[in-house]
Amino acid sequence: VLEVYYTHLRCRCVQESSVFIPRRFIDRIQISPRGNGCPRKEIIVWKKNKSVVCVDPQAEWIQRIMEMLRKKSSSTPPVPVFKRKIP
């Protein structure tokens, strides 16, 4: 089971998955750019069934979603649902 660990570590993803998740089952996405002590970009996906997974930023399918979100946010105000912070 892939999990997000809330520890003292600056990187929050212990494991990452590249397995495709259909968009309709994604509730929200958090993107953490590299920095703040974590040397890599992290993408955390909350699914409609309340489970959480860290996704490999290189996965082609998540890149397609990110690109769509970028296009959307450039034409409309940012959608807060995709900006949820981990407590």
């Epitope: 495709f20 998740i21 259909p22 309709r24 089952f25 699914k47 069934n49 959307k72």
Partner: antibody, heavy 120, light 106 residues
């Protein structure tokens, strides 16, 4: 040729259980998300539940959460729907369908449907 | 949850006619909208996926358009085999079907 064959339907009393099965052939079953849909004349078509490639993730419509369980056996190329605490509003024809594969390709394969009647 | 409002519920037309069926979503569905045809006693069959992509093997007289919340299925030059029930389906967030349009011979 892709085939999806549902079985296990029938007449059942409210509050009782029923398990639907769907046997798949003609494609690599484990490469696909799978789903159950249903159709009852007054309500039209409804999505019921979906399951990921390995069965690790499942998703349900609100009205069946806690009562229905979707599962799969990739070794047998079979999809299941365990239906507990059945209600009259669950009466419908239930269809087994494919969803996306690993690449995001979304084919359109449906079984012939199986009738479930919940009545006393 | 996303609601899909499909109109009209019933449509009478003649062979050779051009008909349009509409679906309106309760929120933006980002073009994740499919159209299905269903004949009596059969499973639904997908005609169009993601707003305007024709499913393999489906005649080119079927076409789809739309964006945001508003989507349309157009059938040009109706053929006898086109008289059936049509449904839209959003798959942007879980799944929701429209209520269906029964296309009947006038």
């Amino acid at each position: 040729e892709v085939q999806l064959a549902e079985s296990g339907g029938g007449l059942v009393q409210p509050g009782r259980s029923l398990k639907l099965s769907c046997s798949a052939s003609g494609f690599t079953f484990s490469d696909y998300y799978m789903a159950w849909f249903r159709q009852a004349p007054p309500k039209g078509l409804e999505w019921v539940a979906s399951i990921s490639y390995d069965g690790g993730d499942s998703f349900y419509r609100d009205s069946v959460k806690g009562r229905f369980t979707i599962s799969r056996d990739n070794a047998k190329s079979s999809l299941y729907l365990q239906m507990d605490s059945l209600r009259s509003e669950d009466t419908a024809t239930y269809y087994c369908t494919t969803e996306e594969d690993y690449s995001g390709s979304f084919p359109d394969y449906w079984g012939q449907g199986v009738m479930v009647t919940v009545s006393s | 949850d996303i609601q899909m409002t499909q109109s009209p519920s019933f449509l009478s037309a003649s062979v050779g006619d051009r008909v349009t069926i509409n679906c309106k979503a309760s929120q933006n569905i980002n073009k994740y909208l499919n159209w299905y045809q269903q004949k009596l006693g059969e499973a639904p069959k997908r005609l169009i996926y993601d707003t305007n992509n024709l499913q393999a093997g489906i005649p080119s007289r079927f076409s789809g358009s739309g964006s945001g919340t508003d989507y349309t299925l157009t059938i040009n030059s109706l053929q006898p085999e086109d008289f059936a029930t049509y449904f839209c389906l959003q798959h942007n967030s879980l799944y929701t079907f429209g209520g269906g349009t029964k296309l009947e011979l006038k």
